[in-house]
């Protein structure tokens, strides 16, 4: 058993049928010695008396808010949550496995640049009685500071018969140098509590590996005289690290017909312009990627050929 | 402590092409190592990230773009002095700091070159003959060092009398390649910045 926060405790259980569970001793936070009784949740049934209460915690029915009283007055509370270890693995019932980029990916994180700011998100089908708390650091043995905000519900989607809820959090490394070579990964820890179930999820990454630039901005077409060709031009996104000559991007320019089946023409360039043939009803799209470290491509920025 | 926006003579900054080749070569070698050594801890998540140049060179700090010198987190307290002559300095106006930066890059390359050559000698003794260093990568390191053209004492290749532990050598190779790729990215960024300056 360990303390999650004041008066909230997590009991770790090896989860299998007929498991013996864990013996837990609760102590009433009071100078009083006599006339103390204990109850669980809203029930008025007295579970025991005395300054301490010993319970065998085996299943969720044994978890909840234990309260000690004296003469009708509440003295203190202890909330017991359960953390299940099933098949040698801590349970992951609360969050959905996003399976990208690999199995058992519950937390996904992205950064728009090298400033040390990043966003993480996760999915669940649970809509109520759900709380999250996020902590982060650079490295784990001698951790350096990363400050995270509160997790917020950022999107709701319908997937078949189920509703899916996306939560996200923004974090900022306290003293980040965009040019630094990372040797210690960022660690993100999410505590999730659903009713009386506790779970924790972690992700470990280097900022360089989660970079995904914003799409190029100010995408414009300039027809070339007496030609079906156009000059496409764009700019670096505002959110990208500066100076751009140091933090350079490379670009992919795509000409896509109306039909998805039509052949796509693609050009790769380090410049912020390119000359392409603009077909009728086609659209021109441009996306960006760090020129020197191949992390994710940005989403496409698009303009119609007409 | 930084790179001023110097104005080199017109034309391609001599080392940019070599640094791009270097990044390509080390990235290819790392990919090959990850595929060949798939049953070894060779991915970024599995290895310990070590920097053999730590406390010996200060490339990131010495080559910091002018725009980042206002960022206190970028101003590390490490001081290292380097030899200051070299043919990549395309302009007489190039400052002392730029020379310091380029000589730091040269020292990095020299250190990695020695490590890789020592390691290759061990890998050639492996009866499994599982993996060797790409000669192209070693040649590209050499080319960039020649382009930088700094006079520096030659570091003798380390020789070891004891029987090599091939498992450890292959893990060390992965660690070295990951670190060298990160340094090659920094070198490429620096050369691109200097070229634009």
């Amino acid at each position: 058993i360990w303390e999650l926060k004041k008066d909230v405790y997590v009991v770790e259980l090896d989860w299998y049928p007929d498991a013996p569970g864990e013996m837990v001793v609760l102590t009433c936070d009071t100078p009083e010695e006599d006339g103390i009784t204990w109850t669980l949740d809203q029930s008025s049934e007295v579970l025991g008396s005395g300054k301490t209460l010993t319970i065998q915690v085996k299943e969720f029915g044994d978890a909840g808010q234990y309260t000690c009283h004296k003469g009708g007055e509440v003295l203190s509370h202890s909330l017991l949550l359960l953390h299940k270890k099933e098949d040698g693995i801590w349970s992951t019932d609360i969050l959905k496995d996003q399976k990208e980029p690999k199995n058992k990916t519950f937390l996904r994180c992205e950064a728009k640049n090298y400033s040390g700011r990043f966003t993480c998100w996760w999915l669940t089908t649970i809509s109520t009685d759900l709380t999250f708390s996020v902590k982060s650091s650079r490295g784990s043995s001698d951790p350096q500071g990363v400050t995270c905000g509160a997790a917020t519900l950022s999107a709701e989607r319908v997937r078949g018969d189920n509703k899916e809820y996306e939560y996200s959090v923004e974090c900022q490394e306290d003293s980040a140098c965009p040019a630094a070579e990372e040797s210690l990964p960022i660690e993100v820890m999410v505590d999730a509590v659903h009713k009386l179930k506790y779970e924790n999820y972690t992700s470990s990454f280097f900022i360089r590996d989660i970079i995904k630039p914003d799409p190029p901005k100010n995408l414009q077409l300039k027809p070339l005289k007496n030609s079906r060709q156009v000059e496409v031009s764009w700019e670096y996104p505002d959110t990208w690290s500066t100076p751009h000559s140091y933090f350079s991007l490379t670009f992919c320019v795509q000409v896509q017909g109306k039909s998805k089946r039509e052949k796509k023409d693609r050009v790769f360039t380090d410049k912020t312009s390119a000359t392409v043939i603009c077909r009728k009803n086609a659209s021109i799209s441009v996306r960006a990627q760090d020129r020197y470290y191949s992390s994710s491509w940005s989403e496409w920025a698009s303009v119609p050929c007409s | 402590r930084n790179l001023p926006v110097a104005t080199p003579d017109p034309g391609m900054f001599p080392c940019l092409h070599h640094s791009q080749n270097l990044l390509r070569a080390v990235s290819n070698m790392l990919q090959k190592a990850r595929q060949t050594l798939e049953f070894y801890p060779c991915t970024s998540e599995e290895i310990d990230h070590e920097d053999i140049t730590k406390d010996k060179t200060s490339t990131v700090e010495a080559c910091l773009p002018l725009e980042l010198t206002k960022n206190e987190s970028c101003l590390n307290s490490r001081e290292t002095s380097f030899i200051t002559n070299g043919s990549c300095l395309a302009s007489r106006k190039t400052s002392f700091m730029m020379a310091l930066c380029l000589s730091s890059i040269y020292e990095d390359l020299k250190m990695y070159q020695v490590e890789f050559k020592t390691m290759n000698a061990k890998l050639l003794m492996d009866p499994k003959r599982q993996i060797f260093l790409d000669q192209n990568m070693l040649a590209v390191i050499d080319e960039l060092m020649q382009a930088l053209n700094f006079n520096s004492e030659t570091v003798p290749q380390k020789s070891s009398l004891e029987e090599p532990d091939f498992y450890k050598t292959k893990i060390k190779l992965c660690i070295l390649l990951h670190a060298f790729r990160i340094r090659a990215v920094t070198i490429d960024r620096v050369m691109s910045y200097l070229n634009a300056s």
Epitope: D14, Y16, P17, K104 | -
Partner: antibody, heavy 115, light 111 residues
Framework: QVQLVQSGGGVVQPGRSLRLSCAAS????????MHWVRQAPGKGLEWVAF????????YYADSVKGRFTISRDNSKNTLYLQMKSLRAEDTAVYYC????????WGQGTMVTVSS | SYVLTQPPSVSGTPGQRVTISCSGG????????VKWYQQLPGTAPKLLIY???QRPSGVPDRFSGSKSGTSASLAITGVQAEDEADYYC????????????FGTGTKVTVL
Amino acid sequence: QVQLVQSGGGVVQPGRSLRLSCAASGFTFSSYGMHWVRQAPGKGLEWVAFIRYDGSNKYYADSVKGRFTISRDNSKNTLYLQMKSLRAEDTAVYYCTTSGSYDYWGQGTMVTVSS
Amino acid sequence: SYVLTQPPSVSGTPGQRVTISCSGGRSNIGSNTVKWYQQLPGTAPKLLIYGNDQRPSGVPDRFSGSKSGTSASLAITGVQAEDEADYYCQSYDRGFTGSRVFGTGTKVTVL
């Protein structure tokens, strides 16, 4: 005490279907994940499928993916394995087992796929 | 599809110490716990060891389990005639939720 009683095995022709059942008693069935494991004659144990306590997630071995479906009815305390497009190599004794570091096994049921 | 490797057979005379090895990798034994089962002919596997070294009640103390790195082993100190059976190790795969991975199995013969 914990008991898992299996049924539904038998002889079936290749390409046909069969449904195995596993009736659980002596524990809160709806609180625990369940597995199916099989053993071909004279061979070792092979994991087949797993279902979460609430049926929300199901996982399968590559050898049965797309052909077998694990399911459960918590109101009936029963686990199922629907097997379609059966092949000769699916011939085995099938066991249901509880999840957890300390697990309980059914008595096994023989499935023979033969023409 | 056996991910864990065991010797096909081991033998010993009554009273001898017999050990069975189980070799895996970083994604299974290296990052998860190990169980051992005993299977007598025509019966369901019986749990002998769980959580690497825990013995269920009713399992004689001559059976013991241990784990080190990516390998595990089962020891039978003072093997008896009734211990003649097939033995399987089992772990979980870190990269694949829910999946149990079994050893190839070892036939223990008491001479």
